[in-house]
Amino acid sequence: CKAMHVAQPAVVLASSRGIASFVCEYASPGKATEVRVTVLRQADSQVTEVCAATYMMGNELTFLDDSICTGTSSGNQVNLTIQGLRAMDTGLYICKVELMYPPPYYLGIGNGTQIYVIDPEPCPDSDF
């Protein structure tokens, strides 16, 4: 089979500070040295890119400075963290992995992680 399998958790609950973390693991058919990881959000049938990073195996994952994502990599496993989430951001977050180099190219798409975000209740006014 030439398809690349990508595994990610089915459900994750964001913290009260709007931070959600999950692991994206891929079964690499070859020995890739350059990998691109993209987080996609699927709402209804619309798919949008949340963030993306290209990294060399053995090096750290580097997202753009203004990205809402951070991450670390270890072998064929990527630990992804998405921050700044609000209740309206609840949805399916898909991990997409591309083995860019060396040939052949492989594409792997996970089944998605349903991230639930609950906005914190505002603090009640204090009399003190």
Epitope: A3, E34, V47, E49, G108
Partner: antibody
Framework: EVQLVESGGGLVKPGGSLRLSCAAS????????MHWVRQAPGKGLEWVSF????????YYADSVKGRFTISRDNAKNSLYLQMNSLRAEDTAVYYC???????????WGQGTMVTVSS | EIVLTQSPGTLSVSPGERATLSCRAS???????LAWYQQKPGQAPRLLIY???SRATGIPDRFSGSGSGTDFTLTISRLEPEDFAVYYC?????????FGQGTKVEIK
């Protein structure tokens, strides 16, 4: 409007060269990998070449390897295909295509005809 | 290289009838990486189905895809006049990206 527009096709003699261009508009070009696909008259679709987001990684069909070069200019939202040592069997309509976020080719240009004949 | 073989080469169907097109891969293709395209004369291909069974934006629900592993099917439940065209399957999970040779759906 989201679209791809090819140009640069024409008639060229065997052994000659041609450079195809594909102008992208209506989307963030640098966020997508791109392809060239061709279709010989009365035949099916044949994938020709792929280029990564930043242009660092390039892949080619065996039939064009060593003769064709794919490139992109993200600042100009443009994709290119430099075709050298052209042969009669390269005669085809050439399409540029965008890879969707989930992998298939979701956006195609109208195509540009390349005819290689003496 | 994954070779995709489509059958039949030509399918003659009356408007309103069902059309079933087959695509067989030389080795297993993950269902997430199989697409179907429609092409009419003088036009560029149009994405119909991706991930083996998900309809692309704007594609009517009379088009449906199914299958896994090496055998995939595109079904058009009730053929409309505008559906007579050539259909291609494609795998996009690994390079080289490959297409089937196409099935022409013509009016009976």
């Amino acid at each position: 409007e989201v679209q791809l527009v090819e140009s640069g096709g024409g008639l060229v003699k065997p052994g000659g060269s041609l450079r195809l261009s594909c102008a992208a508009s209506g989307f963030t070009f640098s966020s997508y990998t791109m392809h060239w696909v061709r279709q010989a008259p009365g035949k099916g679709l044949e994938w020709v070449s792929f280029i990564s987001y930043d242009g660092n990684q390039k892949y080619y069909a065996d039939s064009v390897k060593g003769r064709f070069t794919i490139s992109r200019d993200n600042a100009k939202n443009s994709l290119y295909l430099q075709m050298n040592s052209l042969r009669a069997e390269d005669t085809a309509v050439y399409y540029c295509a965008r890879t969707s976020l989930l992998g298939p080719f979701d956006l195609w240009g109208q195509g540009t005809m390349v005819t290689v004949s003496s | 290289e994954i070779v995709l073989t489509q059958s039949p080469g030509t399918l003659s169907v009356s408007p309103g009838e069902r059309a079933t097109l087959s695509c067989r891969a030389s080795q297993s293709v993950g269902s997430s990486y199989l697409a179907w395209y429609q092409q009419k004369p003088g036009q560029a291909p149009r994405l119909l189905i991706y991930g083996a069974f998900s309809r692309a934006t704007g594609i009517p629900d009379r088009f449906s895809g199914s299958g896994s592993g090496t055998d995939f099917t595109l079904t058009i439940s009730r053929l409309e006049p505008e559906d007579f065209a050539v259909y291609y399957c494609q795998q996009y999970g690994s390079s080289p990206w490959t297409f089937g040779q196409g099935t022409k759906v013509e009016i009976k």
